[in-house]
């Protein structure tokens, strides 16, 4: 039975040209996390596998950095980065848990909601 829950940074905003950390956290389960996928609806950004380490999709290599932890750092943000991001936790024995983050990339310094996850 799947008892865990995914906590995410929720809806966040950041400034164009800046950076943001996407974070998910799996709680309320003793299941072992064996892989985490970071995705958009139609493309894979990165995978962190317990045995194989991190893999960053070539199309994002220049702008995506692994971590901190199982999170993902997006750099040099553009307005086109606005949208939904998903963390998919592969666990044993529970199966998969998914969290959703909505990122809004703003043109000016209107970003405020996601400030504590923003990298200076």
């Amino acid at each position: 039975m799947m008892t865990g829950t995914i906590e995410t940074t929720g809806n966040i905003s950041a400034e164009k040209g800046g950076s943001i950390i996407l974070q998910c956290h799996l709680s309320s389960t003793t299941a072992q996390v064996t892989q985490v996928n970071w995705e958009q609806q139609d493309q894979l950004l990165a995978i962190c596998n317990a045995d194989l380490g991190w893999h960053i999709s070539p199309s994002f290599k220049d702008r995506v950095a692994p971590g901190p932890g199982l999170g993902l750092t997006l750099q040099s943000l553009t307005v086109n980065d606005t949208g939904e991001y998903f963390c998919i936790y592969h666990t044993y024995p529970d199966g998969t848990y998914t969290g959703r983050i909505f990122l809004e990339v703003l043109e000016s310094s209107v970003a405020e909601h996601g400030a504590r996850f923003q990298i200076p």
Partner: antibody, heavy 118, light 107 residues
């Protein structure tokens, strides 16, 4: 549980437009996930055609992009496929399927055979 | 597009046999591969995702492994209901693409 059911004409004439509908029960197509069309010519492999997401965004296979349109009718909890300028090569079993975030397909309709012939 | 090349295209085996199918991707897809079983006149059924994770309710005799470009799907002890066609699929980038299939027949 979630069920998908394809419907539409089984025979389409060459150069015409193929139209199919997928009716989803047990889940609202506006709640989550991406809703896909995948086809399989007789005796051959599978080809992903495209999807419409729960938010209404679409993504198509570039090999078909100029001919394919996927839309939805949220009031009927249905999504549809239109494929224009069909030829005999478009004869296939057409499946609708729900995609999981990771790009795999856990839930499929039973498929419907569409034959393109005059 | 990423090409997925399966081998063999068909194979004969007996109940109780261990069977292995391989799939090679035309580029590195890390662990983003799924495996499906399809019986005649039926829709494909998801067995394995992310190279090695069994989908809900899939028996433990089915397993997957591999990363990068080379992937393996194994049935440890064939059961009568396992005779079918098996497909790999890359879930790394759109357009999502499938292998050409491996038809598993009774010897």
């Amino acid at each position: 549980q979630v069920q998908l059911q394809e419907s539409g004409p089984g025979l389409v004439k060459p150069s015409q437009t193929l139209s199919l509908t997928c009716t989803v029960s047990g889940y609202s197509i506006t709640d989550d996930y991406a809703w896909n069309w995948i086809r399989q010519p007789p005796g051959k492999g599978l080809e992903w055609m495209g999807y419409i997401s729960y938010s209404g965004n679409t993504m198509y296979n570039p090999s078909l992009k100029s001919r394919v349109t996927i839309s939805r009718d949220t009031s009927k909890n249905q999504f549809s496929l239109k494929l224009s300028s069909v030829t005999a090569a478009d004869t296939a079993v057409y499946y609708c399927a729900r995609k999981y975030y990771g790009g795999w397909f856990p839930i499929w309709g039973q498929g419907t055979l569409v034959t393109v012939s005059s | 597009d990423i090409q997925m090349t399966q081998s063999p295209s068909s194979l004969s085996a007996s109940v109780g046999d261990r069977v292995t199918i391989t799939c090679k991707a035309s580029q590195d897809v890390f662990t983003a591969v799924a495996w499906y079983q399809q019986k005649p006149g039926k829709a494909p059924k998801l067995l394995i995702y992310s190279a090695s994770y069994r989908h809900t309710g899939v028996p433990s005799r089915f397993s997957g492994s591999g990363s990068g470009t080379d992937f393996t799907f194994t049935i440890s002890s064939l059961q009568p209901e396992d005779f079918a066609t098996y497909y790999c699929q890359q879930s790394y980038s759109t357009p999502w693409t499938f292998g050409q299939g491996t038809r598993l027949e009774i010897k």
